[in-house]
Interface confidence: medium
């Protein structure tokens, strides 16, 4: 027999099938050109000394064989003696060590048996009603296919599934989606309605993450606020890596879990952008503001559960950095300016109302004035900080106000609003005899004392009504009592107390008259 033809003689070996588990399998035959055909198969077991024979029986009952030697693939033309228009039955017999192993038979019409391609190129993966949906472009000129998938997890072997018949320029498959483990999928196709035809090769792996990305287990720490008004956020613990199936352990696109850091700056709500999302690797510098930080884990199906932390504001206050002058037209704040063209955010909030939203104003980008100061002014009518109460003021600065991570704290301080000189006037001034020539003056704390750093000192004034002599006594802001000495008995005095801030003299309290009684000796 000629090697290019199917030989219509008995094969050169005994044809008893040994029935062993090894041997030829997965025979598939298909047309590879208008007149060319190919059969290929797998051989399970030791290959040394194995000879393969492709057997073919025609519908007439005549049978022939091709001897392929050790090759497990054979190409032949439609002039090799095998009818391509009529149904034929093909199988492989492998002869080794005086025994023959036989593959399962394939019955088909060769002219209709097209070698289908697996899904090629980009396989789109999405989630649909709790299932996995894969979609791909039908390979050219191969519309009309049956499709199968197989899938495995890191701990399971392959399981086979059916995608059903496909009949369009795009094909799709619904597959099971695992909640908490990654999966590897492969797809294969064969011509629709041709049970005898062969399956394509398996596609490249499609790596699919679990429906729920793993909860990110991370910890943060935040450094002290530096002199530049910024503090570094650092990651203490990296998130754990997802376990992957075997075919997804290289660079497998689609299965990755990405972790992102979502920063929400709670302070200064009037600025352009309050939230910024960053890759977890890029740990940012923060201002001294309060932040909420979330770590969001997401995969190709979208975001999963997140972990949120609150980073409190840095409460360190600058005692004298802010200067406030109150005039007839309104109020102006001055502070040491940052670089040219800096935008400032001035935020204030009544002390004790930290839960409520702070008021804030964004300045236009400004340059330092000749004294190197930045300013912010407002009119009396605006009502800003107009109530007579203590306000916490924080000023933030940024040369790039739309970039959340480029804000820094300029200063954090307290200010007493409204008519502070009147509101701060000490009340309940009382005078008690202390000795023959001294008295003790007490008063209730000024409202200014509720405002950290605002009350510079108390001043107690004593006037001798006879001589009109006046003496003033400075008192520490933490004290509400002073002893006046060297007083003369029988003389009328008036005493007043005022509370001063760094930039404002307070109003005197109502005059309190007293005298030390003359002691009459017996």
């Amino acid at each position: 027999c000629r090697t290019s033809e199917c030989c219509f003689q008995d094969p050169p070996y005994s044809d008893a099938d040994s029935g062993s588990a090894s041997g030829p399998r997965d025979l598939s035959c298909y047309r590879i050109s208008s007149a060319g055909y190919e059969c290929s198969w797998q051989y399970e077991g030791p290959t040394a000394g194995v000879s393969h024979f492709l057997r073919c029986c025609l519908s007439s009952g005549r049978c022939c064989y091709f001897a392929t030697g050790s090759a497990t693939r054979l190409q032949f033309s439609d002039q090799a003696g095998v009818s391509v228009l009529h149904t034929v039955t093909l199988w492989v017999e492998s002869w080794a060590r005086n025994r023959t192993e036989k593959s399962p038979e394939v019955t088909l019409q060769l002219y209709k048996s097209v070698k289908y391609k697996p899904p090629l190129g980009d396989i789109k993966v999405s989630k649909l009603a709790g299932q996995l949906r894969m979609e791909w472009e039908t390979p050219d000129n191969q519309v009309g296919a049956e499709v199968q998938f197989r899938h495995r997890t890191p701990s399971s072997s392959w399981k086979l599934g059916d995608c059903g018949p496909q009949d369009d320029d795009t094909e799709s498959c619904l597959c099971p989606l695992e909640m908490n483990v990654a999966q590897e999928f492969q797809l294969r196709r064969r011509r629709l309605g041709s049970q005898g035809s062969s399956w394509s090769k398996w596609s490249s792996p499609v790596c699919v993450p679990p429906e729920n990305p793993p909860q990110p287990q991370v910890r943060f720490s935040v450094e002290q606020l530096g002199r530049d008004g910024r503090r570094r956020l650092t990651l203490k613990e990296q998130p754990t890596q997802l376990e992957l199936p075997e075919g997804c352990q290289g660079p497998a696109p689609g299965v990755e879990v990405t972790y992102q850091l979502q920063l929400h700056m709670l302070s200064c709500p009037c600025k352009a952008k309050a939230t910024r999302t960053l890759p977890l690797e890029k740990m940012p510098y923060l201002s001294g503001a309060a932040y909420n930080v979330a770590v969001i884990s997401s995969n190709r199906f979208g975001p999963g559960p997140n972990q949120t932390w609150h980073i409190p504001a840095d409460t360190h206050t600058e005692p004298v950095a802010l200067n406030i002058s109150v005039g007839t037209n309104g109020t102006t704040m001055y502070w040491p300016a940052r670089a040219q063209s800096t935008t400032y955010c001035i935020e204030w909030q009544p002390v004790g109302q930290e839960g409520s939203l702070a008021t804030c104003n964004l300045t236009a980008p400004q340059d330092p004035d000749p004294a190197g100061m930045a300013t912010y002014s407002w009119s009396r009518e605006s009502g800003a900080m107009g109530q007579e109460k203590c306000y916490h003021i924080t000023i933030f600065a940024s040369a790039h106000p739309k970039k959340l991570t480029l804000w820094s704290t300029v200063l954090s301080t307290y200010h007493f609003g409204g008519n502070a000189s009147a509101a701060g006037t000490p009340h309940h001034v009382s005078v008690k005899n202390h000795s023959l020539d001294s008295v003790s003056v007490d008063w209730a704390p000024s409202l200014l004392s509720t405002c950290p750093g605002v009350l510079k000192e108390y001043v107690v004034r004593c006037r001798d009504e006879d001589s009109n002599q006046v003496s003033e006594h400075p008192v520490q802001p933490t004290e509400t009592q002073v002893t006046l000495s060297d007083l003369r008995a029988g003389v009328a005095y008036t005493v007043q107390v005022r509370a001063d801030t760094a930039w404002l003299r307070g109003a005197w309290s109502q005059p309190q008259r007293f005298s030390i009684k003359v002691q009459v000796s017996d």
Epitope: R31, A35, K112, N141
Partner: antibody, heavy 119, light 107 residues
Framework: EVQLVESGGGLVQPGGSLRLSCAAS????????MSWVRQAPGKGLEWVAN????????YYVDSVKGRFTISRDNAKNSLYLQMNSLRAEDTAVYYC????????????WGQGTLVTVSS | DIQMTQSPSSLSASVGDRVTITCQAS??????LNWYQQKPGKAPKLLIY???NLETGVPSRFSGSGSGTDFTFTISSLQPEDIATYYC?????????FGPGTKVDIK
């Protein structure tokens, strides 16, 4: 450019014979199955016969079996249809067609030749 | 033999209309089905093979779909040059058989 040109048609009496030819050019003739397809006046298309590349396999529609013979000469790039015992119902335009993409898909056709069987 | 039927046998439509022709096989032929166009006095021309694959050089307004026994041929926007008779043809088994044709003309 693929070209198929039929010839040999004409008027013939019932019971008579005729030999149609199809000259092929622009492709490797010996690599393709070839077919004859006919079309009765005002009617649809009917596949008549086809032949394998080397002429070793030939298939016919039942209505012409035993009367018509398909053959080819690869050296001359020619396809033939020998028609014997012609009947009135064989009157048609006969087209030669290449089965190019695969068997049963006629991707190129000749312009046809008219066979009229009439007394 | 496998019988092929087509409907409608003829239709008139306006330029720009969507035209649909159906073809039915007497038994399951998978997607072994082709569509041809034949203009008056001319040889047929292959448009679609394997039920839905567009032959090279054929305008994309022509499309085909279906599998098994029911098939559809569509012209998405009828043009004057599309006046012709359209035939379906099966090649699942010998003898290869054609549908009776659908004649398409312009209103």
């Amino acid at each position: 450019e693929v070209q198929l040109v039929e010839s040999g048609g004409g008027l013939v009496q019932p019971g008579g014979s005729l030999r149609l030819s199809c000259a092929a050019s622009g492709f490797t003739f010996s690599s393709y199955w070839m077919s004859w397809v006919r079309q009765a006046p005002g009617k649809g298309l009917e596949w008549v016969a086809n032949i394998k590349q080397d002429g070793s396999e030939k298939y016919y529609v039942d209505s012409v079996k035993g009367r018509f013979t398909i053959s080819r000469d690869n050296a001359k790039n020619s396809l033939y249809l020998q028609m014997n015992s012609l009947r009135a119902e064989d009157t048609a335009v006969y087209y030669c067609a290449r089965e190019g993409l695969q068997l049963g898909i006629f991707d190129y056709w000749g312009q046809g030749t008219l066979v009229t069987v009439s007394s | 033999d496998i019988q092929m039927t087509q409907s409608p046998s003829s239709l008139s439509a306006s330029v720009g209309d969507r035209v649909t022709i159906t073809c039915q096989a007497s038994q399951d032929i998978s997607n072994y089905l082709n569509w041809y166009q034949q203009k008056p006095g001319k040889a047929p021309k292959l448009l679609i093979y394997d039920a839905s694959n567009l032959e090279t050089g054929v305008p994309s307004r022509f499309s085909g779909s279906g599998s098994g026994t029911d098939f559809t041929f569509t012209i998405s926007s009828l043009q004057p040059e599309d006046i012709a008779t359209y035939y379906c043809q099966q090649y699942d088994n010998l003898p290869f058989t054609f549908g009776p044709g659908t004649k398409v003309d312009i209103k």
